[in-house]
């Protein structure tokens, strides 16, 4: 059974992940329209189901494309200090949270998503899991 310390650690990791995803989303929402329009042609895959930590496998598999689009879209109005480090940190958290005991084959929804929809989906996921832990 999970101990209170392991639950607290999971909660802190989820909060860290949530903040990272929100930071990216805030940066994107600050884009001027034409640039955002171009970014929205970059497609992301969404999980068919995301209700448990193990479903973070679906986020892990889309981190490379996320890093790509953030690198491509850097500008004065949106400059992440180091995209590679940010994605690497997210990846570390995701790996710890989902665990490695069971390797899940991610099931994706038929419809793809824009970067904004993709980030919102995973932000909602983090918020939902955090609320069950508190």
């Amino acid at each position: 059974a999970p101990t209170s310390s392991s639950t607290k650690k999971t909660q802190l990791q989820l909060e860290h992940l949530l903040l990272d995803l929100q930071m990216i989303l805030n940066g994107i929402n600050n884009y001027k329209n034409p640039k955002l329009t171009r970014m929205l042609t970059f497609k992301f895959y969404m999980p068919k189901k995301a209700t448990e930590l193990r479903h973070l496998q679906c986020l892990e598999e889309e981190l490379k494309p996320l890093e790509e689009v953030l690198n491509l879209a850097q500008s004065k109005s949106f400059h992440l200090r180091d995209t590679k480090d940010l994605i690497s940190n997210i990846n570390v958290i995701v790996l710890e949270l989902k665990g490695s005991e069971t390797t899940l084959m991610c099931e994706y929804a038929d419809e793809t998503a824009t970067i904004v929809e993709f980030l919102n989906r995973w932000i909602t996921f983090c918020q939902s899991i955090i609320s069950t832990l508190t």
Epitope: Y31, V69, L72, K76, S77
Partner: antibody
Framework: EVQLVQSGAEVKKPGESLKISCKGS????????IGWVRQMPGKGLEWMGI????????RYSPSFQGQVTISADKSISTAYLQWSSLKASDTAMYYC??????????????WGQGTTVTVSS | DIVMTQTPLSLPVTPGEPASISCRST????????????LDWYLQKPGQSPQLLIY???YRASGVPDRFSGSGSGTDFTLKISRVEAEDVGVYYC?????????FGGGTKVEIK
């Protein structure tokens, strides 16, 4: 090896229908846009439109909207370009090309060998 | 639509000599304040499919020799070949992907003198 293989040359009469294909291999076909480019005899390249096979999201250049239909079958990693009623002016070489996860942020890095379409009575 | 204009239409070249092709767009191809310039160069060799040479203004595509280079800013762009080789003959096209629909230049035919 990453490649796009197109269907063979076609000779058709005006008013006939046609569907040409472009089969991708060696990469995740569903995760990259596939564009279609026309080259009329002795002329330059014209960008016709594009499809994302993962969800069949399709965008057409205004010049080609309503003239052709772009589709894809992700189960067999194939994109299609079709005409319901061919005209003599559709005589051209047609190329498919891969364009990454966003057609704004990636060049057309892999091209098919082209399909020659001849429309003549 | 963004119109792409290439000059010259035809370019006779001498092997070993440099060559330069110009491309002009009707609006700036800069993506955002200091983002990427969304311009590519393609080469179509005789009887072949086009191939990507240079992407995002100045990045050489995989396998492209370093004698090819792309430069420019805003609306004026140049493709340079430092020392032309016989295998470089064909038609060169610039293409913008800043705005939909994507558009090609009319092409520049490079041939050996």
């Amino acid at each position: 090896e990453v490649q796009l293989v197109q269907s063979g040359a076609e000779v058709k009469k005006p008013g006939e229908s046609l569907k040409i294909s472009c089969k991708g291999s060696g990469y995740s076909f569903t995760s990259q846009w596939i564009g279609w480019v026309r080259q009329m005899p002795g002329k330059g390249l014209e960008w016709m439109g594009i499809i994302f096979p993962g969800d069949s999201d399709t965008r057409y250049s205004p010049s080609f909207q309503g003239q052709v239909t772009i589709s894809a079958d992700k189960s067999i990693s194939t994109a299609y370009l079709q005409w319901s009623s061919l005209k003599a002016s559709d005589t051209a070489m047609y190329y498919c090309a891969r364009q990454g996860r966003s057609y704004h942020y990636y060049g057309m890095d892999v091209w098919g060998q082209g399909t020659t379409v001849t429309v003549s009575s | 639509d963004i119109v792409m204009t290439q000059t010259p239409l035809s370019l006779p070249v001498t092997p070993g000599e440099p060559a330069s092709i110009s491309c002009r767009s009707t609006q700036s191809l800069l993506d955002g304040d200091d983002g990427n310039t969304l311009l590519d160069w393609y080469l179509q060799k005789p009887g072949q499919s086009p191939q990507l040479l240079i992407y995002t203004l100045s990045y050489r595509a995989s396998g492209v020799p370093d004698r090819f280079s792309g430069s420019g800013s805003g609306t004026d762009f140049t493709l340079k070949i430092s020392r032309v080789e016989a295998e470089d003959v064909g038609v060169y096209y610039c293409m913008q992907r800043l705005e939909f629909p994507l558009t090609f230049g009319g092409g520049t035919k490079v041939e050996i003198k």
